[in-house]
Interface confidence: low
């Protein structure tokens, strides 16, 4: 390998290097490649040089395109017709000179916050692109359409958020925003101007025309209308609060919808239970006033008894299933019919047939095993399923089982 590299001179973006050749193993060196490493790089990386191609008789080169105020070390790698040799020992570590910052923060945005606030956020500039000590940000903002920028200096490289609080900030009003950079050398560029909205006022009017209906023992559907009067705060969605009659309202559960949806389904409820519901509009500032409360009682639970005594027969590519009628208990919903779920043994998707009888005829090919289960259904939802029945593939035309 070549002997250790010397850094003869260093500027903010360049480094003048020199080295002495090592033994060539009886095959002349045809070229040298310069590699650099920093605290921010993943291992050694090839760097651009002048001259661009360093021949085997050249023992000095200038590395270009370095980042200011970053600690570098360099090494050389020799190559000949046989291949690439071992790298040289690294040079000493040297820091490039400082320079004005050139990279602006990414993703300047913001919004939200509390009343009378303008929240501005951005992604910090990585340390290796700060170009010098004393790095910080200049946050510039102005009401949309106004001439004068308001400026705030944040003397911290880690700052990624600024909140302007002032009673003069109207709810949800647009501001032009840009974020610049500086370091000990002076000011760098600003990011492109973007529009950020100040904090909202929470909705001021309640939703109207609340209506709820029970879909089953476990599910309720709630409908409402947008507030009849114009809200001062924009509406991002609605919060539905619901609680059992025997519980306290402050312990209600809440679900939120997003956007202008004006209905939602509430699931995982108990059967035969009286629920109270109320709806509020919300946005990033909070929730508005509550609608009037409405009441709805979930339907009786579905039958808990599964179908029993299931018998099957097969003939002429048909399977005939019979089972005992399921009787609902007093506190259960009446049986409206039965669902027969079946699938081939190898098939993952299940097919369903509904019937109001206690028998069903399935036309199925006989070259497959079948898995079948039966469950009652009611206004309260689906009842308990029977055990799964496996009907083996039938080679002859007639078979039976239970």
């Amino acid at each position: 390998p070549p002997e250790a590299v010397t850094i003869d001179e260093i500027t903010d973006t360049t480094a003048q290097l020199s080295w002495r050749p090592g033994p060539d193993n009886h095959s002349p060196i045809t070229m040298y490649v310069i590699q650099a490493r920093t605290p921010f790089s993943v291992g050694w990386q090839a760097v651009s040089t002048v001259p661009e191609l360093i021949d085997g008789k050249t023992f000095t080169a200038t590395v270009v395109g370095l980042n200011p105020w970053v600690e570098y070390e360099f090494r050389t790698v020799a190559a000949n017709v046989i291949g690439i040799g071992e790298p040289s020992r690294p040079s000493e570590k040297r820091r490039t000179e400082e320079a004005l910052p050139e990279v602006t923060p990414a993703n300047v945005s913001g919004g939200g916050g509390s009343k009378s606030e303008l929240v501005i956020t951005w992604e910090t500039v990585p340390e290796e692109l700060q170009n010098g000590r004393g790095f910080g940000y200049v946050v510039a903002f102005r009401p949309y359409g106004k001439m004068i920028w308001m400026l705030t200096v944040l003397a911290s490289a880690d700052a990624s958020r600024y909140v302007f609080r002032n009673e003069s900030v109207h709810p949800f009003s647009p501001f032009e925003v840009k974020v610049g950079v500086f370091n000990n050398k002076g000011e760098g560029p600003f990011s492109p101007t973007t529009v950020v909205y100040s904090a909202e006022e929470e909705p001021t009017k309640p939703p109207a025309s609340i209506f709820a209906r029970s879909l089953s023992a476990t599910d309720i559907e709630v409908f409402w209308a947008s507030p009849l009067e114009k809200n001062r705060g924009r509406i991002q969605g609605y919060e539905v609060k619901y609680w059992r009659h025997e519980d306290k309202e402050e312990n209600a559960r809440k679900i939120r919808t997003v956007g202008n949806q004006t209905s939602t389904k509430i699931t995982n409820l108990k059967g035969s239970v009286l629920y109270h519901l109320a709806v509020k509009a919300y946005n990033s500032a909070g929730t508005g006033p509550s609608s009037a409360t409405v009441n709805v009682t979930t339907r009786k639970p579905p039958p808990s008894q599964p179908p029993g005594n299931i018998i099957w027969n097969s003939s002429d590519s048909k399977i005939i299933l019979n089972w005992d009628q399921v009787k609902a208990l007093d506190n259960e919903s009446e049986v409206k019919g039965y669902k027969v779920l079946y699938r081939w043994n190898r098939q993952s998707s299940t097919s369903v047939i509904e019937t109001n009888k206690t028998s069903v005829e399935l036309s199925l090919p006989f070259d497959e095993d079948y898995i079948i289960e039966i469950k009652p259904f009611s206004d309260g939802g689906d009842g308990s399923s029977s055990e799964q029945i496996r009907i083996p593939k039938i080679s002859n035309a007639y078979a039976r089982g239970s």
């Epitope: 476990t218 919060e239 609680w243 059992r244 025997e246 519980d247 306290k248 402050e250 312990n251 209600a252 559960r253 809440k254 679900i255 939120r256 995982n268 108990k270």
Partner: antibody, heavy 123, light 101 residues
């Protein structure tokens, strides 16, 4: 006085199973949602599962869904957690806990906690 | 996901505010001391369980909740976790270590 006493923890190999129990006393067990919450050594709290008072509704963290089953026997005032296909990352102290009110919901209102039982998954 | 500052310090007798940001239908706050189980100090945003000193209070606005300790005491030094839910998932914040100086 509310008391929750966990048991069933111990050392188990990856892929193995374990069943935790929690004996509850001092409150009307069937009226309250119950929880399992875990805490890996030196780490924060992680919600595992929740079950409604009657046992009809269950909720699971995505990390355990399909592997863990929460259940309860209201006649015995006991909460269970069946843990299958255990992984090294399931190693933690597992706490049994109860909701603050008869229908307070979720991790916003867990009012009483057991002292925890340590589950170690290691080969 | 609920986000908390990893560490906060307060001088003895002063007021400290611990925040928790992220969507939740409701927020709760838990205090945990080394080797002990957590203790609920605030539930459903603002409610204080019996036995919790009134120097602990909770509030929420939008997608942020706050636990305020007015006149912090030495025994308040602990880890504090926020908890909440969204849809069918419950979640805890990463915890804030409170040091009382």
């Amino acid at each position: 006085e509310v008391q929750l006493l966990e048991s069933g923890g111990g050392l188990v190999q990856p892929g193995g199973s374990l069943r935790l129990s929690c004996a509850a006393s001092g409150f009307t067990f069937s009226s309250f949602n119950m929880f399992w919450v875990r805490q890996a050594p030196g780490k924060g709290l992680e919600w595992v599962a929740e079950i409604s008072g009657g046992g009809g509704s269950t909720w699971y963290a995505p990390a355990v869904k399909g592997r863990f089953t929460i259940s309860r026997d209201n006649s015995k005032n006991t909460l269970y957690l069946q843990m299958n296909s255990l992984r090294a990352e399931d190693t933690a102290v597992y706490y049994c806990a109860k909701s603050a009110d008869t229908w307070s919901y979720g991790a916003a209102s867990i009012s009483a906690w057991g002292q925890g039982t340590l589950v170690t998954v290691s080969s | 996901e609920l986000t908390q500052d990893p560490a906060v310090s307060v001088a003895l007798g002063q007021t400290v505010r611990i925040t928790c940001s992220g969507r939740s239908g409701s927020y709760g706050w838990y205090q945990q001391k080394p080797g002990q189980a957590p203790v609920l100090v605030i539930y459903d945003n603002t409610n204080r369980p019996s036995g919790i000193p009134d120097r602990f209070s909770g509030s929420s606005s939008g997608n942020t909740a706050s636990l305020t300790i007015t006149g912090a005491q030495a025994e308040d030094e602990a880890d504090y976790y926020c908890g909440g839910y969204w849809g069918s998932t419950d979640v805890f914040g990463g915890g804030t270590k409170l040091t009382v100086l």
